[in-house]
């Protein structure tokens, strides 16, 4: 669709004559017949197919046409068309006398004719204006043309329709040739597409206007490319949503589990050396001069009786000092200036000479020791507890404490880790030497059958378009992670349709 | 069920400050970024902060800057907003959220919003 303009500049006949040579009376009073059609090798008489317009009386014998385009637009004369335009024509300009005001082409005479020039050829859609001047024997006619696309029309042909819009089925102006040219923010054929947050993840990130960044399920962050772990994963990261991969030291399915227990509390004292054995399970190896299951007890050094003979122990800063009876000496009084004479066996001990009495040698009662049978009988020296339990002398009897997990007199036996129940959902739990096992029934598993093994969510290819499906393990439904271009908890709608959220 | 509770808010003086709390239950705090947002009588809801999962990443709209703080205490499931140099057009209901999209300044679509808290700035 366009208009086919022509521009009347200038009329010229001086003599005021008709084309059959005759004077007008008083003068010639000029309009103009247009006609425009189809390119024709020899312009002839037939239809305007194009288009006819005529004139109002413009002047008399010869004038000037002013450019009346604001006022009213006669002129340039208009000859729209709604067809695309052929790029050749023809044309007819008539000039007419017009001896009343009635300008009907039945209402004239037939010799009211002033002159006619057909002209025909080639002319491209352009703003500029082609000049043509026409001379006959009486007059000359001087004008100019064009054609112009109508609003919204485009192209070399003016047959591209391109209506500017900016709204939910584009967004975008049109160019010259009429190609869409998208507004800031949009892309895509028809300008549809809005361009997201800079960075915005491609695949776990959409947008539905320019500029942001909407995360698909399972992902977060400014630019969705943070994955969500698993609900209740508590010391472990993701790389795919509803993971949970567990910290150094960390297990089980929600990484809760500690497995290193020495470096997250540190429970040997005075500098012992700490040693993982299981969940929540260490063993310290306790520095000389301490003792206990932490560590946590200072050992005297006279606490092992090093001083024999009935020598009192004296503890010293650097080691401990033995305070030897009369009639011995030594570092631990072990050395003997007495013989059986001297009675020198206590406690009851019975004393038998040696060396032709030069020296002697208790025979100790039970419970007594020593080369005197000076010392009760230290009934933890031969170590009895078991599994690292403490031993410690009670009188005549002797005691072990024992190490959490175990128990008996000897600490000799492993508490059962099953008495608590540790099995959910009516599993069958095993005792293990460093732990336990659960055997867990059917629909269920996880170390202590505490998560439920569900049908798997994707199995029945629930999401559209290529989407990837995740089973979310702790719901028992799946989660779709749309391609670009896709959005809707099935990854159902193109973007563009406005999707419905489960927020 | 996801819940966000906040607490903390009141009628201060201009200039005065306030500390908005926001406990979360019913899903894993520390997994997830959280936002403050707050909505003016008559108008609409405006982005105030955010934190990202770990608490060391913090952003904040042009309006606050240098006068709020955000931060979270993950063992806690808390989120907290420092409110310092209160102006009157600060006055608003306060909510946490969940956010689920950006645009160029900060989130402005969210998951789970709590229930809000008052915050009124007489002059």
């Known amino acids: 669709s366009g208009v086919f303009q022509l521009q009347l500049q200038e009329f010229i006949n001086e003599r005021g004559v008709l084309a059959s040579g005759r004077p007008c009376e008083p003068g010639c009073r000029t309009f103009f017949r247009v006609c425009l059609k189809h390119f024709q090798a020899v312009v002839s008489p037939g239809p305007c197919t194009f288009g006819t317009v005529s004139t109002p009386v413009l002047g008399t014998n010869s004038f000037a046409v002013r450019d009346d385009s604001s006022g009213g637009g006669r002129n340039p004369l208009q000859l729209p068309f709604n067809f695309t335009w052929p790029g050749t024509f023809s044309l007819i300009i008539e000039a007419w006398h017009a001896p009343g005001d009635d300008l009907r082409p039945e209402a004239l005479p037939p010799d009211a004719l002033i002159s006619k020039i057909a002209i025909q050829g080639s002319l491209a859609v352009g703003q500029n204006w082609l000049l043509d001047e026409q001379t006959s024997t009486l007059t000359r006619l001087r004008y100019s043309y064009r054609v112009i696309c109508s609003d919204n029309y485009y192209g070399d042909n003016c047959s591209r329709l391109c209506k500017k819009r900016n709204d939910h089925f584009g967004h975008y102006v049109c160019q010259p040739d009429g190609n869409l040219s998208c507004l800031p923010g949009w892309t895509g054929e028809y300008c549809q597409q809005p361009i997201c947050l800079s960075g915005c993840h491609e695949q776990n990130g959409y947008c539905s206007k320019p500029a942001e960044c909407l995360c698909r399920p399972g992902w977060q962050g400014r630019l969705c490319n943070e994955c969500i772990p698993h609900n209740g994963c508590r010391h472990g990261t993701c790389s795919t949503p509803w993971q949970c991969t567990c910290d150094e030291g960390w297990g089980g399915l929600f990484c809760d589990q500690d497995l290193n227990y020495c470096t997250h509390h540190s429970p040997c004292k005075n500098g012992a050396t700490c040693s993982n054995s299981g969940q929540r399970s260490y063993t310290c190896t306790c520095r000389p001069g301490y003792t206990g299951v932490d560590c946590e007890l200072e050992l005297s050094e006279c606490d092992s009786n090093p001083c024999r003979n009935g020598g009192s122990c004296k503890d010293q800063e650097d080691g401990y000092h033995c305070l030897c009876p009369p009639g011995y000496y030594g570092l631990h009084c072990e050395h003997s200036t007495l013989s059986c004479a001297d009675s020198p066996c206590f406690n009851g001990g019975s004393c038998r000479e040696r060396n032709q009495g030069a020296n002697y040698a208790c025979e100790c009662p039970p419970n007594f020791t020593g080369s005197n049978c000076e010392k009760k009988v230290d009934r933890c020296t031969s170590n009895p507890c078991a599994n690292g339990g403490q031993c410690l002398n009670r009188g005549p009897s002797r005691m072990c404490r024992c190490r959490p997990g175990f128990t008996g007199t000897y600490c000799e036996l492993h508490v059962s880790d099953c008495a608590r129940n540790p099995c959910a959902h009516g599993g069958t739990c095993h005792d293990l030497e460093n732990g336990l096992m659960c055997t867990c029934p059917a629909g269920f598993s996880g170390r202590r059958c505490e998560v439920r093994t569900s049908i798997d969510a994707c199995a029945s290819s629930p999401c559209f378009n290529r989407a990837t499906c995740y089973t979310d393990l702790s719901t028992d439904t799946f989660v779709c992670n749309c391609p670009y271009g896709f959005v809707g908890s099935r990854c159902e709608f193109p973007v563009g349709l406005p999707p419905s959220f489960p927020w | 069920e996801v819940q966000l509770v906040e607490s903390g808010g009141g009628l201060v003086q201009a200039g005065g400050s306030l500390r908005l709390s926001c406990a979360a239950s019913?899903?894993?705090?520390?997994?997830?970024?959280m936002s403050w947002v707050r909505q003016a009588p008559g108008k609409g809801p405006e982005w105030v902060s955010a934190?990202?999962?770990?608490?060391?990443?913090?952003y904040y709209a042009d309006l606050v800057k240098g006068r709020f703080t955000i931060s979270r205490d993950n063992a806690k499931n808390t989120l907290y907003l420092q409110m310092n140099s209160l102006k009157p057009e600060d006055t608003a209901v306060y909510y946490c959220a969940i956010p689920r999209g950006w645009g160029p300044t900060g989130p402005h679509e969210y998951g789970y919003w709590g229930q809000g808290t008052q915050v009124t700035v007489s002059s």
């Open positions: 934190i990202n999962s770990g608490g060391g990443i913090t």
């Open positions: 019913g899903f894993t705090f520390g997994s997830y970024d």
